[in-house]
């Protein structure tokens, strides 16, 4: 969570000051041009300044760094590597900065980095080693606890010839560096599926946000190992039904709260188990709001109010009786 401090506690650097000292080593704890700094709050804000690269002269005290609303385009390896290192930097917000490429090792030499927000950047090229820093099969553990990657999907014409889901998951799993990750937000990314291995390798997750994607099914996803998971956001997807295996896994998680609003539930015979479960489970939040989308005759019916007689499937006609 970002600190709040009054604007008056921030000092701004005038551009002419920056140019006046550019030939010399940066003064200790000076404020970069186009940024606002508060040593008391350990915060630097370089917001909506159309910066094209990360300032080189960030003060060593910085704990919270906001670089939002810029035009960074590329985050190279060691983008935040400094001498001495930014040893205190714990929260880094790069949202809405037109990043389309994050290279391997972009966040290296940030030993205290716990929160990283890359949301609202069209990441056409996210290196598999963006967070792990190396291509070793097992990397040094990342200090990251929160990783916010909401709406990082690029426009369709800018996507490379590979699965966007696969690219993101590769970065999450590389070197098993994110074993300590507790919060992962992947909302609004047009995900069609969740690769089956991703959750098994993020055992420390407490909060997982997959809302506003295009997930149709969770059949091949296992939540079993996420024994610390407290909240699972699946609102605004394309889920049609949850099957018994998924229901049992969710039901068994000791801390879980599940959010399922605004999915196009198909209320046919395959929905019977889920309705039975919903009537008794306490883990689904706002379960009384869940309604059918299909078939047409069931549209807007409340799932909790359905009984087995409501949930039928049209008989499948043998080929000889089917009409075109």
């Amino acid at each position: 969570s970002s600190p709040t401090s009054s604007a008056s506690s921030f000092s701004s650097s005038a551009p002419f000051l920056a140019s006046a000292v550019s030939a010399q080593p940066p003064l200790p704890d000076q404020c970069p041009a186009l940024c606002e700094c508060s040593e008391a709050a350990r915060t630097v804000k370089c917001v909506n300044r159309n910066l094209t690269e990360v300032p080189t002269d960030l003060p060593a005290y910085v704990r919270n760094l906001f670089l939002t609303g810029n035009q960074l385009a590329v985050l190279p390896a060691g983008a935040f590597a400094r001498r001495p290192p930014l040893a205190e930097l714990a929260a880094l917000n790069l949202s809405g900065s037109r990043l389309d490429e994050v290279r391997a090792g972009a966040f290296e030499h940030l030993p205290s980095l716990r929160q990283l927000d890359l949301s609202h950047n069209p990441l056409a090229d996210l290196s598999p080693f963006a967070f792990s820093g190396s291509n070793a099969s097992v990397s040094a553990p990342s200090p990251l606890v929160e990783l916010i990657l909401n709406h990082i999907v690029p426009p369709e014409d800018e996507r490379q010839n590979r699965s966007f889901e696969g690219m993101v998951v590769a970065a999450l799993l590389a070197g098993r560096a994110l074993q300590g990750l507790r919060r992962l937000e992947l909302a609004s990314n047009h995900f069609l599926y969740l690769p089956r291995d991703v959750l098994a390798q993020l055992p420390s997750l407490r909060h997982l946000d997959l809302s506003n994607n295009s997930l149709v099914s969770l059949t091949y996803v296992s939540f079993r190992n996420l024994t610390h998971l407290e909240s699972l956001h699946l609102e605004d997807n394309a889920l049609k039904v949850l099957h018994n295996g998924t229901l049992a896994e969710l039901q068994g998680l000791p801390h879980i709260r599940v959010f399922l609003d605004n999915n196009p539930w198909v209320c046919d015979c395959h929905m019977a188990d889920m309705v039975t479960w919903l009537k008794e489970t306490e883990v689904v939040q706002g379960k009384d709001r869940l309604t059918c989308a299909y078939p047409e005759k069931m549209r807007n019916r409340v799932l909790l109010e359905l009984n087995s007689a409501d949930l039928d499937c049209d008989p499948i006609l043998p080929p000889s009786l089917q009409t075109s």
């Epitope: 039901q251 000791p254 709260r257 489970t281 706002g286």
Partner: antibody
Framework: EVQLVESGGGLVQPGGSLRLSCAAS????????MSWVRQAPGKGLEWVGF??????????ENSASVKGRFTISRDNSKSSLYLQMNSLKTEDTAVYYC?????????????WGQGTLVTVSS | DIVLTQSPLSLPVTPGEPASISCRAS??????????LQWYLQKPGQSPQLLIY???NVESGVPDRFSGSGSGTDFTLKISRVEAEDIGVYFC?????????FGGGTKVEIK
């Protein structure tokens, strides 16, 4: 650190009323179901009821033995849980515990307060 | 309501020796693959503390000499080597159905 502190117990006559409070701290109060459990002197534990979390509309469930007489409520701005007890009977004499349900409430209570004694006697 | 029957009512134990308590439910407490059966210990003058949840999961901070087993209707709490601090009343509880119910308790005391 999770803490639950009950207050409001005391001596009350049969037919009288009493309101118990439970002050909670150390966790996000609105995320959790909260409950009351009682224990008559020298006896076992009896579940009184619970109140659901924000996601499930703060609705309540009570045991048959107190239904219509006891009301569970919460003030989320104060992180406080309440038990309003009306039409008290001598058999309501007990230590009343406030308890927090685990995140998945099917696994029941993981933290308990120290209890407050309610004595119903003429 | 689901009735939980604990046995024995009283259990005299010798420190260092194992101990076992049984809890039987009048109907299954299983729901979608998990048995929602907990074990609590109430030490003298204290409030109950959670030992085991979901029949077999040991609560964080609870010594590993405690273990739980069973499914459906029959459950067991085991203490591998009883210590003096383990004395008190042990309760099982089901949270499969409302109302939640408790067993009558088993008093564990040193011989």
């Amino acid at each position: 650190e999770v803490q639950l502190v009950e207050s409001g117990g005391g001596l009350v006559q049969p037919g009288g009323s009493l309101r118990l409070s439970c002050a909670a701290s150390g966790f996000t109060f609105t995320d959790y179901y909260m409950s009351w459990v009682r224990q008559a002197p020298g006896k076992g534990l009896e579940w009184v009821g619970f109140i659901r979390n924000k996601g499930n509309g703060y609705t309540t469930e009570n045991s048959a033995s107190v239904k219509g007489r006891f009301t569970i409520s919460r003030d989320n701005s104060k992180s406080s849980l309440y038990l309003q007890m009306n039409s008290l009977k001598t058999e309501d004499t007990a230590v009343y515990y406030c308890a927090r349900y685990r995140g998945n409430p099917h696994y029941a209570m993981d933290y308990w307060g120290q209890g407050t004694l309610v004595t119903v006697s003429s | 309501d689901i009735v939980l029957t604990q046995s024995p009512l009283s259990l005299p134990v010798t420190p260092g020796e194992p101990a076992s308590i049984s809890c039987r439910a009048s109907e299954s407490v299983e729901f979608y693959g998990t048995s929602f059966l907990q074990w609590y210990l109430q030490k003298p003058g204290q409030s109950p503390q959670l030992l085991i949840y979901g029949a077999s999961n040991v609560e964080s901070g609870v010594p590993d000499r405690f273990s739980g087993s069973g499914s459906g209707t029959d459950f067991t709490l085991k203490i591998s080597r009883v210590e003096a601090e383990d004395i008190g009343v042990y309760f099982c509880q089901q949270s499969r159905k409302v109302p939640s119910t408790f067993g009558g308790g088993t008093k564990v005391e040193i011989k």
